[in-house]
């Protein structure tokens, strides 16, 4: 069966949005206006993974680029990373536990899960415009907590 | 053609029991997976229960778990759900949904759907 995905832009508790910061980063920030254009459209692929009532395995890739996020041991520390790949192979329902991240919803809010590294989270700094990052730790400085706007194709 | 024809719908009192059943066509169906999506009087689509593919992992929706039961049968191209300890609550239109994925808690994706067969839980 085919790899169902959908468009959605994803933004922080603080509605911080991402965007684009050179070719293999993402950073967040408030925009505002015809701003708003600059924020990443994500292709959300729905994969295979561990799945309950409230934690869906996806894999976040950037729409209509070959860029998927995923998570990687960098000195000894997990990491998230932007990973090219091959846009004949890519997505599929089985990808590699790097890209996939435990989408878990509580109290209409999201967080991401690494699927590599449990208990480690996509996550953003207070700050503006601070590079999106994988954090260790929940309910502390750093922001966990996103929204999903979907996205027409 | 896809086709998704449920069955085995109808009057029953609480504390009841009904078995439905999806008996599928037009695609392969051990390739997907399914699910059951309800529709009660006057109200939204709610997401009730999938099956992987294989039918090796499954889910349901916190208002029905322990109570009912979704299998397949990849041999017959059939999905069944088990209903057990039914409530008034329970009465709806049942159906049956190819590629059923579930995006939130309340959003779902899906290819096709059946009719549905209507289950009434009444004394």
């Known amino acids: 069966a085919p790899v169902r995905s959908l468009n959605c832009t994803l933004r922080d508790s603080q509605q911080k949005s991402l965007v684009m910061s050179g070719p293999y980063e993402l950073k967040a920030l408030h925009l505002q206006g015809q701003d708003m254009e600059q924020q990443v459209v994500f292709s959300m692929s729905f994969v295979q993974g561990e799945e309950s009532n409230d934690k869906i395995p996806v894999a976040l890739g950037l729409k209509e680029k070959n860029l998927y996020l995923s998570c990687v041991l960098k000195d000894d520390k997990p990491t998230l990373q932007l990973e090219s790949v091959d846009p004949k192979n890519y997505p599929k329902k089985k990808m590699e536990k790097r890209f996939v991240f435990n989408k878990i919803e509580i109290n209409n809010k999201l967080e991401f899960e690494s699927a590599q590294f449990p208990n480690w989270y996509i996550s953003t700094s207070q700050a503006e415009n601070m590079p999106v990052f994988l954090g260790g730790t929940k309910g502390g400085q750093d922001i966990t907590d996103f929204t999903m706007q979907f996205v027409s194709s | 053609e896809v086709q998704l024809l449920e069955s085995g719908g109808g009057l029953v009192q609480p504390g009841g029991s009904l078995r439905l059943s999806c008996a599928a066509s037009?695609?392969?169906?051990?390739?997907?997976?399914m699910g059951w999506v309800r529709q009660a009087p006057g109200k939204g689509l709610e997401w009730v229960s999938s099956?992987?593919?294989?039918?090796?992992?499954?889910y349901y929706a916190d208002s029905v778990k322990g109570r009912f039961t979704i299998s397949r049968d990849d041999s017959k191209n059939t999905l069944y759900l088990q209903m057990n300890s039914l409530r008034a609550e329970d009465t709806a239109v049942y159906y049956c949904?190819?590629?059923?994925?579930?995006?939130?808690?309340?959003?779902?994706?899906?290819?096709?759907w059946g009719q549905g067969t209507l289950v009434t839980v009444s004394s």
């Open positions: 949904a190819e590629n059923l994925v579930r995006v939130t808690a309340r959003k779902w994706m899906f290819d096709y």
């Open positions: 037009g695609f392969t169906f051990e390739d997907y997976q």
């Open positions: 099956i992987s593919a294989m039918g090796n992992r499954t």
